[in-house]
């Protein structure tokens, strides 16, 4: 049974996680973006399931393309600077939230979304669980 | 890591099929399409066509229409590119690439060397 | 079907210089060019996506820059291990088409 300084880590890593990406969700909002229509055009796979930490494999395996979608906002009119490290950031969370003994394979709901609904529904799914913890 | 790895070389003879394979790890299988392209000793890049492993829709560059086919196992994470009718002009090293909208073909496999002599 | 036209198809350059390759299309194609490095007996790597992005890995002496149908690919600085051939990829529509290669040799 998890501890409660294990569920504390839990909730800290997931509220870092959702800082991280409501990060990443502001700062392609920005107005100063001038990537933000192309970005949108790409289509990113959502899960079909997302209710457990260890659905966050499908999260993990859509990070690379996140990383080379923002990475085209790269430019010094955008503030969302160092994608890379970012990106290595979440995935470290990640893969201590979802645990590397089990490698599910991720099932991808059929619909695909844009990079704003993608991480909505990542942030959503760390809102839900945090309120489970706490 | 993400790998593509590839079947052997073979050698074929004129009017003869060649199969080759593609073996994805290290991501889902379904959410990239595979591309085929080829390269003639000293010759440049030729793209053959692409699959897409979720729904098995194919597309085929002209030149190869009628005698290529791109077929996949997703339950093994493997596609699969047959060339039939094969001719000397068809020698040639075949890569297998993944591909995904605009990100362009960021993983190819190692190539696998078809030769076509009688 | 859109064709792609490289120049120079080779180019003598010294370790050091900047170097400037050339893609054109025969039609518009916005940003969806990629560049590719190919040394002998390897398969391509991806140097160059979306005309200007660089993926992870890539040294930053690489870049990209155009759209619609003028592309160029600029090596800052030529290192020994950037001697091989370069190629540009169009990837806005099927069939997919590669400029026919510049090969990039050691003055």
């Known amino acids: 049974a998890p501890t409660s300084s294990s569920t504390k880590k839990t909730q800290l890593q997931l509220e870092h996680l959702l800082l991280d990406l409501q990060m990443i969700l502001n700062g392609i909002n920005n107005y100063k973006n001038p990537k933000l229509t192309r970005m949108l055009t790409f289509k990113f796979y959502m899960p079909k399931k997302a209710t457990e930490l260890r659905h966050l494999q499908c999260l993990e395996e859509e990070l690379k393309p996140l990383e080379e979608v923002l990475n085209l906002a790269q430019s010094k009119s955008f503030h969302l600077r160092d994608t890379k490290d970012l990106i290595s950031n979440i995935n470290v969370i990640v893969l201590e939230l979802k645990g590397s003994e089990t490698t599910l394979m991720c099932e991808y709901a059929d619909e695909t979304a844009t990079i704003v609904e993608f991480l909505n529904r990542w942030i959503t799914f760390c809102q839900s669980i945090i309120s489970t913890l706490t | 890591q993400v790998q593509l790895v590839q079947s052997g070389a073979e050698v074929k003879k004129p009017g003869a099929s060649v199969k080759v394979s593609c073996k994805a790890s290290?991501?889902?299988?379904?959410?990239?399409?595979i591309n085929w392209v080829r390269q003639a000793t000293g010759q440049g890049l030729e793209w053959m066509g692409w699959?897409?492993?979720?729904?098995?829709?194919?597309g085929y560059a002209q030149k190869f229409q009628g005698r290529v086919t791109m077929t996949r196992n997703t339950s093994i994470s493997t596609a699969y590119m047959e060339l039939s009718s094969l001719r000397s002009e068809d020698t040639a090293v075949y890569y297998c690439?993944?591909?995904?909208?605009?990100?362009?073909?960021?993983?190819w496999g190692q190539g696998t060397l078809v030769t076509v002599s009688s | 079907d859109i064709q792609m036209t490289q120049s120079p198809s080779s180019l003598s350059a010294s370790v050091g210089d900047r170097v400037t390759i050339t893609c054109r299309a025969s039609?518009?194609?916005?940003?969806?060019l990629g560049w590719y490095q190919q040394k002998p007996g390897k398969a391509p790597q991806r140097l160059i996506y979306?005309?200007?992005s660089l993926p992870s890995g890539v040294p930053s002496r690489f870049s990209g820059s155009g759209s619609g149908t003028e592309f160029t690919l600029t090596i800052s600085s030529l290192q020994p291990e950037d001697f091989a051939t370069y190629y540009c990829?169009?990837?806005?529509?099927?069939?997919?088409?590669f400029g026919q290669g510049t090969k990039l040799e050691i003055r």
């Open positions: 690439a993944r591909g995904r909208q605009w990100l362009g073909f960021d993983y």
């Open positions: 290290g991501y889902t299988f379904t959410t990239y399409d």
């Open positions: 699959m897409n492993p979720n729904s098995g829709n194919t």
């Open positions: 039609q518009g194609i916005g940003d969806d």
């Open positions: 979306s005309a200007s």
């Open positions: 990829l169009q990837h806005n529509s099927y069939p997919r088409s």
